[in-house]
Interface confidence: low
């Protein structure tokens, strides 16, 4: 058993049929010594008396808010949550496996630049009685500070018969050094509580590996005289690290016909312009990637050819 | 060429070669497309590689103030990785074909380090750790990790030289 926060405790249980469970001793936070009784949740049934209560925690029915009273007055509470371990593996019932980029990916994170700011998100099908708490650091043995905000519900989607809820959180490294080569990864820890079930999820990454620039901005076409060619130009996204002479991007320019089956013409360039042939009903798209480190490409920015 | 306290390096040449190094580091890794590194586990690892850290002066402001600190650090890293790529980890079984990206990477690391340091002048270099993998699979894992860390190192070096070529070239 360990303390998650004040008056909230997590009991770690091996979860299998007829498991013995864990013996837990609760102590009433009071100077009083006698006349103390204990109840669980809203029930008025007295579970025991005395300053301490010993219980065998085996299942969710044994978890909940234990309250000690004296003469009708509440003295203190202890909320017991359960953390299940099945076949040696901690349960992951609350969050959905996103399966990208690999199986057992519950948390996904992205950064728009090297400033030390990043966003993580996760999915669940649970709509109520759900709380999240997020902590982060750089490195684990001698951790350096990363400050995370509160997790918020950022999207709702319907998937077949189910509703899916996306939560996200923004974090910022306290003393970020954008130009340095990271040697210790960022660690992100999410505590999830659904009713009386506790689970924790972790992710470890370097900012450089989760970089995904915003799409290029101000995408424009300029027809060239007496030619089917056009000059496409664009700018670095506002959110990208500066100076651009140091934090450089490379770009992919694509000409795509109306039909998905039509052959795509692609050009790669380090410049912020390119000359391409504009076909009728086609569109021109540009995306960006860090020039020197192969992290994710941005989403496409597009304009129609006409 | 970068002599401590002396003249500037050939920024444009360094920029071109460091960008080539980035391309090579990514084409060389993974050496086989069939290795799936999930979690690092407790296998032998490469913690001792030199990293370009915050105080090394490789940020735009530090380069403007005095690029020598950063160039010395980059040089040290290039020599370190050049030695690693020439060690038993990369020369042992399973052996690499002579035209593999690793062979080109090795040559380019040497080329860039020589651009930064003329003959006869010696900056202090870091000892390479004694990583002696016992069998081919461990060698593959070490190659994988070394190349992954080299990708991060050469990305910073390439940014330094790109910025230098754009803003510090005479």
């Amino acid at each position: 058993i360990w303390e998650l926060k004040k008056d909230v405790y997590v009991v770690e249980l091996d979860w299998y049929p007829d498991a013995p469970g864990e013996m837990v001793v609760l102590t009433c936070d009071t100077p009083e010594e006698d006349g103390i009784t204990w109840t669980l949740d809203q029930s008025s049934e007295v579970l025991g008396s005395g300053k301490t209560l010993t219980i065998q925690v085996k299942e969710f029915g044994d978890a909940g808010q234990y309250t000690c009273h004296k003469g009708g007055e509440v003295l203190s509470h202890s909320l017991l949550l359960l953390h299940k371990k099945e076949d040696g593996i901690w349960s992951t019932d609350i969050l959905k496996d996103q399966k990208e980029p690999k199986n057992k990916t519950f948390l996904r994170c992205e950064a728009k630049n090297y400033s030390g700011r990043f966003t993580c998100w996760w999915l669940t099908t649970i709509s109520t009685d759900l709380t999240f708490s997020v902590k982060s650091s750089r490195g684990s043995s001698d951790p350096q500070g990363v400050t995370c905000g509160a997790a918020t519900l950022s999207a709702e989607r319907v998937r077949g018969d189910n509703k899916e809820y996306e939560y996200s959180v923004e974090c910022q490294e306290d003393s970020a050094c954008p130009a340095a080569e990271e040697s210790l990864p960022i660690e992100v820890m999410v505590d999830a509580v659904h009713k009386l079930k506790y689970e924790n999820y972790t992710s470890s990454f370097f900012i450089r590996d989760i970089i995904k620039p915003d799409p290029p901005k101000n995408l424009q076409l300029k027809p060239l005289k007496n030619s089917r060619q056009v000059e496409v130009s664009w700018e670095y996204p506002d959110t990208w690290s500066t100076p651009h002479s140091y934090f450089s991007l490379t770009f992919c320019v694509q000409v795509q016909g109306k039909s998905k089956r039509e052959k795509k013409d692609r050009v790669f360039t380090d410049k912020t312009s390119a000359t391409v042939i504009c076909r009728k009903n086609a569109s021109i798209s540009v995306r960006a990637q860090d020039r020197y480190y192969s992290s994710s490409w941005s989403e496409w920015a597009s304009v129609p050819c006409s | 060429r970068a002599v401590p306290g002396g003249s500037s390096p050939a920024w444009t040449q360094c920029q071109q070669l460091s960008q080539k190094l980035c391309t090579l580091a990514w084409s060389a890794h993974p050496l086989v497309g069939h290795m799936d590194l999930r979690e690092e586990g407790d296998e032998e690892t490469t913690n001792d590689v030199p990293h370009i850290q915050c105080g090394d002066g490789c940020d735009p402001q530090g380069l403007r103030d005095n690029s020598q600190f950063c160039l010395q650090r980059i040089h040290q890293g290039l020599i370190f990785y050049e030695k690693l790529l020439g060690s038993d980890i990369f020369t042992g079984e399973p052996s690499l074909l002579p035209d593999s990206p690793v062979a080109q990477l090795h040559a380019s690391l040497l080329g860039l380090s020589q651009l930064l340091q003329p003959e006869g002048h010696h900056w202090e270099t870091q000892q390479i750790p004694s990583l002696s993998p016992s069998q081919p699979w461990q060698r593959l894992l070490l190659r994988f990790k070394i190349l992954r860390s080299l990708q991060a190192f050469v990305a910073v070096a390439a940014r330094v030289f790109a910025h230098g070529a754009a803003t510090l070239s005479p």
Epitope: - | L31, V32, G33, H34, M35, D36, L37, R38, E39, E40, G41, D42, E43, E93, P94, S95, L96, L97, S100, S134, Q135, P136, W137, L140, L141, F144
Partner: antibody, heavy 117, light 109 residues
Framework: QVQLVQSGAEVKKPGESLKISCKGS????????IGWVRQMPGKGLEWMGI????????WYSPSFQGQVTISADKSISTAYLQWSSLKASDTAMYYC??????????WGQGTLVTVSS | DIVLTQPPSVSGAPGQRVTISCTGS?????????VHWYQQLPGTAPKLLIY???KRPSGVPDRFSGSKSGTSASLAITGLQSEDEADYYC?????????FGGGTKLTVL
């Protein structure tokens, strides 16, 4: 003594999933990689892939990449080979073998997998 | 597709010497990769016979020896005995996997 003990023979239908195991004993499991080798009826040996003792690195033969999954659980000194959807052509004897300084110096007894409708 | 070529069968009388060849290419044996040999007795799992071109694991009689030259390797068995009747496989590397030869059936006449 040093041995690798494999799970028993399996008879399956096409499309079914299967996971076979290979348990090491009598040596330090965490020093050795475990490889899997297929032998189709009356045919030669084919290397499928190998896994590090912690299960953190798998390396597949190009011919088997995406066809099978190799995993390991160091805590119980066991390596696994699994299929999500078997085909009749997966009918074969499957051997596990350990690799350290010497290549595949100890082999399991083999698991015969028969896939037939 | 087999990238190491072995003769499908060889035979010899008891007491004789036989050799089994294993021919590769510049992308496996010729690249400096080691060659290993395995023996598979009927109905049993393979057993390591020779590793690192010519090294014998403990317990393997010195009647078995291996050698390698250029892009090929060979296994020699002297003083042939009836219990040597088995399939023999050579093995090496390519840049992307371990490869086995097609196997050679040794018959003791």
């Amino acid at each position: 003594q040093v041995q690798l003990v494999q799970s028993g023979a399996e008879v399956k239908k096409p499309g079914e999933s299967l996971k076979i195991s290979c348990k090491g004993s009598g040596y330090s499991f965490s020093n050795y990689w475990i490889g899997w080798v297929r032998q189709m009826p009356g045919k030669g040996l084919e290397w499928m892939g190998i896994i590090s003792p912690t299960g953190s690195v798998t390396w597949y033969s190009p011919s088997f990449q995406g066809q099978v999954t190799i995993s390991a659980d160091k805590s119980i000194s066991t390596a696994y080979l699994q299929w999500s959807s078997l085909k009749a052509s997966d009918t074969a004897m499957y051997y596990c073998a350990r690799w350290y300084y010497k290549p595949f110096d100890v082999w399991g007894q083999g698991t015969l997998v028969t896939v037939s409708s | 597709d087999i990238v190491l070529t072995q003769p499908p069968s060889v035979s010899g009388a008891p007491g004789q010497r036989v050799t089994i060849s294993c021919t590769g290419s510049s992308s496996n044996i010729g690249s400096g990769y080691d060659v290993h040999w395995y023996q598979q007795l009927p109905g049993t799992a393979p057993k390591l016979l020779i590793y690192g071109n010519s090294k014998r694991p403990s317990g393997v009689p010195d009647r078995f020896s291996g050698s390698k030259s250029g892009t090929s390797a060979s296994l020699a068995i002297t003083g042939l005995q009836s219990e040597d009747e088995a399939d023999y496989y050579c093995s090496s590397w390519t840049p992307s996997s371990v490869v086995f030869g097609g196997g050679t059936k040794l018959t003791v006449l």
